[in-house]
């Protein structure tokens, strides 16, 4: 059965997924999709990486961690009840039937009504919002939260570690800058460069 994750309407939801690159920079293509993982690919792709970069994403979905170290956890911005459901993280390891796939269930709860405005700490506070706008144009700088260099022995959702407050502090204190590729295509809602 799927591992369950929760967020409130209006918050950012975080769905963890990790793998260990065979060597630094030796990345594996990954896709995220809405719906349970089918036999190949991801049901309805919302984001994907190739061997080098994030090469396709749709609005509100991004990778806040250091995907170059194998943190391909998905952040969904400003969730609504419609974002509830199963999401697929697929690590597309080359070879014969080598893919690793994970189904993660996202449960969205209605927002709590609070009497006075207070600083909300949602469960994704450990994963800082990007400090500059996302890559809608050529070579635009994006500042992302990155995972500390922890030892990931195998692909895992690492749910326990992510609930660890020390990790949360490390994440809040770290940052990484990634340049948006100049051949991203911006069509409002979908952003990609071709995979060839």
């Amino acid at each position: 059965s799927e591992v369950e994750y929760r967020a409130e309407v209006g918050q950012n939801a975080y769905l963890p997924c990790f793998y260990t690159p065979a060597a630094p920079g030796n990345l594996v293509p990954v896709c995220w999709g809405k719906g349970a993982c089918p036999v190949f690919e991801c049901g309805n792709v919302v984001l994907r990486t190739d061997e080098r970069d994030v090469n396709y994403w749709t609005s509100r979905y991004w990778l806040n961690g250091d995907f170059r170290k194998g943190d391909v956890s998905l952040t969904i911005e400003n969730v609504t009840l419609a974002d509830s459901g199963i999401y697929c993280c697929r690590i597309q390891i080359p070879g014969i039937m080598n893919d690793e796939k994970f189904n993660l269930k996202l449960v969205i709860k209605p927002a709590k009504v609070t009497p006075a405005p207070t600083r909300q700490r949602d469960f994704t506070a450990a994963f800082p919002r990007m400090l500059t706008t996302r890559g809608h144009g050529p070579a635009e700088t994006q500042t992302l939260g990155s995972l500390p260099d922890i030892n990931l022995t195998q692909i895992s959702t690492l749910a326990n570690e992510l609930r660890d407050s020390r990790l949360a502090n490390d994440l809040r204190d770290s940052g990484a800058t990634i340049r948006g590729s100049s051949d991203y295509k911006d069509d409002d809602d979908k952003h990609h460069h071709h995979h060839h």
């Epitope: 896709c31 349970a36 089918p38 690919e41 049901g43 396709y56 597309q92 039937m97 995979h195």
Partner: antibody
Framework: EVKLVESGGGLVQPGGSLRLSCAAS????????MAWVRQAPGKGLEWVAN????????YYLDSLKSRFTISRDNAKNSLYLQMNSLRAEDTAVYYC???????????????WGQGTLVTVSS | DIQMTQSPSSLSASVGDRVTITCRAS??????LAWYQQKPGKAPKLLIY???TLAEGVPSRFSGSGSGTDFTLTISSLQPEDFATYYC?????????FGQGTKLEIK
Amino acid sequence: EVKLVESGGGLVQPGGSLRLSCAASGFTFSDYYMAWVRQAPGKGLEWVANINYDGSSTYYLDSLKSRFTISRDNAKNSLYLQMNSLRAEDTAVYYCARDVGYYGGNYGFAYWGQGTLVTVSS
Amino acid sequence: DIQMTQSPSSLSASVGDRVTITCRASDNIYSYLAWYQQKPGKAPKLLIYNAKTLAEGVPSRFSGSGSGTDFTLTISSLQPEDFATYYCQQHYGSPLTFGQGTKLEIK
């Protein structure tokens, strides 16, 4: 117009080899997973193998993966199936089919070739 | 492996009839189900994908429903060209598997 044309079938003795080819046209070949599906005479459909966009990942029916190899050449818009150590039970029409695309979503074999008959007999 | 079981195996019906073919998966396949039509000596033709989405160029008298383990293909008003064999197929687990087929014959 999407077109898939298989070739390479024929009569082969048990233990022999054949290489099937599928020429694709009318779509961006490298944007799609491709598959081979077979149908023995008077029988139902049986999936054989799939291959991803660039050929780096392959998927097989367990009982065939030691003898069959799926591959593709995106520069030639071609899909292949190398069949070794053929047996009488491999006798079938072999179809090439287009599977899911780069952005997912549509799970079904949307286009099929006309098929090529492989007969394994002494 | 996920087994796909179609029923009935064969069916006799008349032009204008409403026909329903069912397909049951041995495990949850969500909505990753396709339906195909095959005529003798021809390649299969995709009718429905993702359990209920009509493939391009397929007449609206064909419809699909279901999710999880139980699925249905319905032909609302049989036409002469609809007499053929119909297969369901799952795209959720490896290996991909087909139902054994339902032969639709003229009564």
